[in-house]
């Protein structure tokens, strides 16, 4: 049989951020290669990453076709140099991945504060609307395009001289907050999808502070 020195893949894990989606698995191959297949629950299997010695496969192109679908992948193991060999049951060894629904499970990438502008005692903070690899009509959609009002941002802001973090929330990419005149503030934002139960929050954006080049100050 061609399976004597072929082992099935294990620890199949989806790694996905802002819909960039990679399936990873173990073990590192010794005298074997892998092919990955992916399908929706009701769809046909599509093969990817043919006869690879990698232990990962980028499945982004497949999942972005419909991010609200639930996907299943499987990893086939073949003896190196003899990929026609099959197991004793007439099939190569394979292992199934957990199910994966991109819209519900992709991690939210670290957001970026695009700009902030102070006018008197108001500050407008704008979050960059990150581009994803999801396409519609040949155009790449932004995170806001994909998630709509399901996506909110939490702004943490604090006086440079203090530690307590005030919060504000928006379901757009802009905040308008009240600040004390003559005080410098720092900002950090976090993306949140409240309707989720897991992967609800992104990591925090890098901190941006007033008095640095990203912002603009206008005295009225």
């Amino acid at each position: 049989s061609g399976t004597t020195n072929t082992v099935a893949a294990y620890n199949l894990t989806w790694k996905s951020t802002n819909f960039k989606t990679i399936l990873e698995w173990e073990p590192k191959p010794v005298n074997q290669v892998y092919t990955v297949q992916i399908s929706t629950k009701s769809g046909d299997w599509k093969s990817k990453c043919f006869y690879t010695t990698d232990t990962e496969c980028d499945l982004t192109d497949e999942i972005v076709k419909d991010v609200k679908q639930t996907y299943l992948a499987r990893v086939f193991s073949y003896p190196a140099g003899n990929v026609e060999s099959t197991g004793s049951a007439g099939e190569p060894l394979y292992e199934n991945s957990p199910e994966f629904t991109p819209y519900l499970e992709t991690n939210l990438g670290q957001p970026t504060i695009q700009s902030f502008e102070q006018v008197g005692t108001k500050v407008n903070v704008t979050v960059e609307d990150e581009r994803t690899l999801v396409r519609r009509n040949n155009t790449f959609l932004s995170l806001r395009d994909v998630f709509g009002k399901d996506l909110i941002y939490t702004l943490y802001y604090w006086k440079s001289s203090s530690s307590g973090k005030k919060t504000a929330k928006t379901n757009t990419n802009e905040f308008l907050i009240d600040v004390d005149k003559g005080e410098n503030y720092c900002f950090s934002v976090q993306a949140v999808i409240p309707s989720r139960t897991v992967n609800r929050k992104s990591t925090d954006s890098p901190v941006e502070c007033m008095g640095q080049e990203k912002g603009e100050f206008r005295e009225i």
């Epitope: 909110i152 939490t154 943490y156 530690s163 307590g164 973090k165 005030k166 919060t167 504000a168 929330k169 928006t170 379901n171 009240d178 976090q190 949140v192 409240p194 309707s195 989720r196 139960t197 897991v198 992967n199 609800r200 929050k201 990591t203 925090d204």
Partner: antibody, heavy 120, light 107 residues
């Protein structure tokens, strides 16, 4: 089932310290925010402070700033309220509550509360 | 800090009565107002969020509305289990603040 259980309350002398715990089950605290709210006997609700367990960010009411510290241990799925330099006016039932984190819903689940009495 | 002024502080009503409690914010809080019910010795329970949305599992006799910075909690037909204290809270800005509470008692 989402549940929050406070513990650690009791009688303490003025100037003393106490640490309250808020053990969460049915959800992971780092995905949400945890607030502490207190209620003096026969009085209304007073917000104490919050923590985002994902990053440790906190904010406190002026009445407790510098004396109280909120922390969280995500591995234990538990938030804490460390209370130092306690005063008679800190006597209250202390509740922890979960902040759902949306624009709309705020404190959707509350613990049963734990009584802190500051008296000599 | 934003003040939430709640009125009345207490009221007496009978089963079947329509009850209205109001809360006035000291500045604009958009719709970021919640209403809670608290019974003696128990934790508060969320009733209304975002000024007018009924929280899951809350009876439809409870409703909320907003007019500018004025917020209203209405119980259309008071039931025996509704005798409790009600609090409004704004969460538009940090720190979030509560109204002083309204105790609804049996007439």
């Amino acid at each position: 089932e989402v549940q929050l259980v406070e513990s650690g309350g009791g009688l303490v002398q003025p100037g003393g310290s106490l640490r309250l715990s808020c053990a969460a089950s049915g959800f992971t605290i780092h995905e949400y925010w945890i607030h502490w709210v207190r209620q003096a006997p026969g009085k209304g609700l007073e917000w104490v402070g919050y923590i985002d367990p994902a990053n440790g960010f906190t904010y406190y009411a002026d009445s407790v700033k510098g004396r109280f510290t909120i922390s969280a241990d995500t591995s234990k799925n538990t938030a804490y309220l460390q209370m130092n330099s306690l005063r008679a006016e800190d006597t209250a039932v202390y509740y922890c509550a979960r902040d759902y984190g949306s624009l709309q819903v705020f404190l959707d689940y509350w613990g049963q509360g734990t009584l802190v009495t500051v008296s000599s | 800090d934003i003040q939430m002024t709640q009125s009345p502080s207490s009221l007496s009503a009978s089963v079947g009565d329509r009850v209205t409690i109001t809360c006035r914010a000291s500045q604009d809080v958009n719709t970021a107002v919640a209403w809670y019910q608290q019974k003696p010795g128990k934790a508060p329970k969320l009733l209304i969020y975002s000024a007018s949305f009924l929280y899951s599992g809350v009876p439809s006799r409870f409703s909320g509305s907003r007019s500018g910075t004025d917020f209203t909690l209405t119980i259309s037909s008071l039931q025996p289990e509704d005798f409790a204290t009600y609090y409004c809270q704004q969460h538009y800005t940090t720190p979030p603040t509560f109204g002083q509470g309204t105790k609804v008692e049996i007439k």
